[in-house]
Amino acid sequence: LIIGFGISGRHSITVTTVASAGNIGEDGILSCTFEPDIKLSDIVIQWLKEGVLGLVHEFKEGKDELSEQDEMFRGRTAVFADQVIVGNASLRLKNVQLTDAGTYKCYIITSKGKGNANLEYKTGAFSMPEVNVDYNASSETLRCEAPRWFPQPTVVWASQVDQGANFSEVSNTSFELNSENVTMKVVSVLYNVTINNTYSCMIENDIAKATGDIKVTESEIKRRSHLQLLNSKAS
């Protein structure tokens, strides 16, 4: 938690941010909360980015004030105007770009005082894996596919029955560049699959970790996937 101390007689207010990650091409949220004020017209929100001359976004007197907004953020930012009064200064960032990564400052002025907090924003690509069974003449393989990752992740297979086993010798992973030439499709194939077992395909980079599980029996196949963003730290 970072508390900004007051200058020239004004009190400080507590501003809290959470480090987060944006998925390239999708919309992202830069989280920031502050001690609320009773009057919307007394609240000023400024978002700044280290190394960028113009503002990322400014909200004051109950509306956006974008005259000093930097070109790289033009038309891509918005605050949740109806939630500002309750202390939500989070910024919605549309169509996240790789270059949006960096250190952001959420700077707040209210009638109670002012405060700020920094936020580390990472950008990349991450997606849910899907694990399917492929059939050969008399054996099965598992195919784990995830459409969009960046930077290039690691892929590790695990199994419930053979806990701690290393499947690198019986698996093959490939990365195929997508059409926008940044993100990549991840495909990993696991050979020598045995029935009555649950396998996990774990894909991880420095931004996210995703797991696709598949339970394989004679009579059914059950799948489950989940994705977790890494390094979500509060400041």
């Epitope: 069974v133 699959v193 394989v216 029996t217 004679e218 009579s219 059914e220 196949i221 799948r223």
Partner: antibody, heavy 117, light 106 residues
């Protein structure tokens, strides 16, 4: 090469029973289940039942009272028996290999059954 | 039981055409759907499993798609040897089949 070969009678009288043997090659019944499916012009393809690799069975609820499936792993044979046959049991009966997740992949050549007096 | 409905009983086509056969499940079956081809006097032959994955040796002109309740089998550049009956089947529970679609020449 995976093969399922069926043998059984072509004509059975009403109220009698049907017995079909499915002899498999190219895979072991210790590792694969075998389904039974029938096909008739009136009802299309109908799943009848399955014997799993471990020997347990599942049956279509419509046939559970008159159907039994068993196997002899050492002879690579699966046995199908259906009792109390009626004219509407006239169909082609197939044995089919099971794959992981209940997928039916390799089919026998079929046994054509006519139930008639 | 889950009912698989193939509304097209017969589809007429010409060699080289593209044809799409549809199948609807009475409830959500995820992608646990297979497609079979059956020629007269022969046993059904597995073409597609998991709704969209081609089985071993199946030509790439056969494509499956769909999930949930709506599924399609598309045959691109139809060949004379493709004239047959096509059945969809769900195997998320005890298997049930569609009534079939016969592909014939115009």
């Amino acid at each position: 090469q995976v093969q399922l070969k069926q043998s059984g009678p072509g004509l059975v009288q009403p109220s009698q029973s049907l017995s079909i043997t499915c002899t498999v090659s190219g895979f072991s019944l210790a590792n694969f289940g075998v389904h039974w499916v029938r096909q008739s012009p009136g009802k299309g393809l109908e799943w009848l039942g399955v014997i799993w690799s471990g020997g347990s069975t599942d049956y279509n609820a419509l046939f559970i009272s008159r159907l039994s499936i068993s196997k002899d792993i050492s002879k690579s044979q699966v046995f199908f028996k259906m009792n109390s046959l009626q004219a509407d049991d006239t169909a082609i009966y197939y044995c089919v290999r099971n794959r992981v997740g209940r997928l039916l992949d390799s089919w026998g050549q079929g046994t054509t059954l006519t139930v008639s007096s | 039981d889950i009912v698989m409905t193939q509304s097209q009983k017969v589809m007429s086509t010409t060699v080289g055409d593209r044809v799409t056969i549809t199948c609807k499940a009475s409830q959500n079956v995820d992608t646990v759907v297979a497609w079979y081809q059956q020629k007269p006097g022969q046993s059904p032959k597995l073409l597609i499993h998991s709704a969209s994955r081609r089985y071993i040796g199946v030509p790439d002109r056969f494509t499956g798609s769909g999930s949930g309740t709506d599924f399609t089998l598309t045959i691109n550049n139809v060949q004379s040897e493709d004239l047959a009956d096509y059945f969809c089947q769900q195997y998320s529970t005890n298997p049930t089949f569609g009534a079939g679609t016969m592909l014939e020449l115009k």
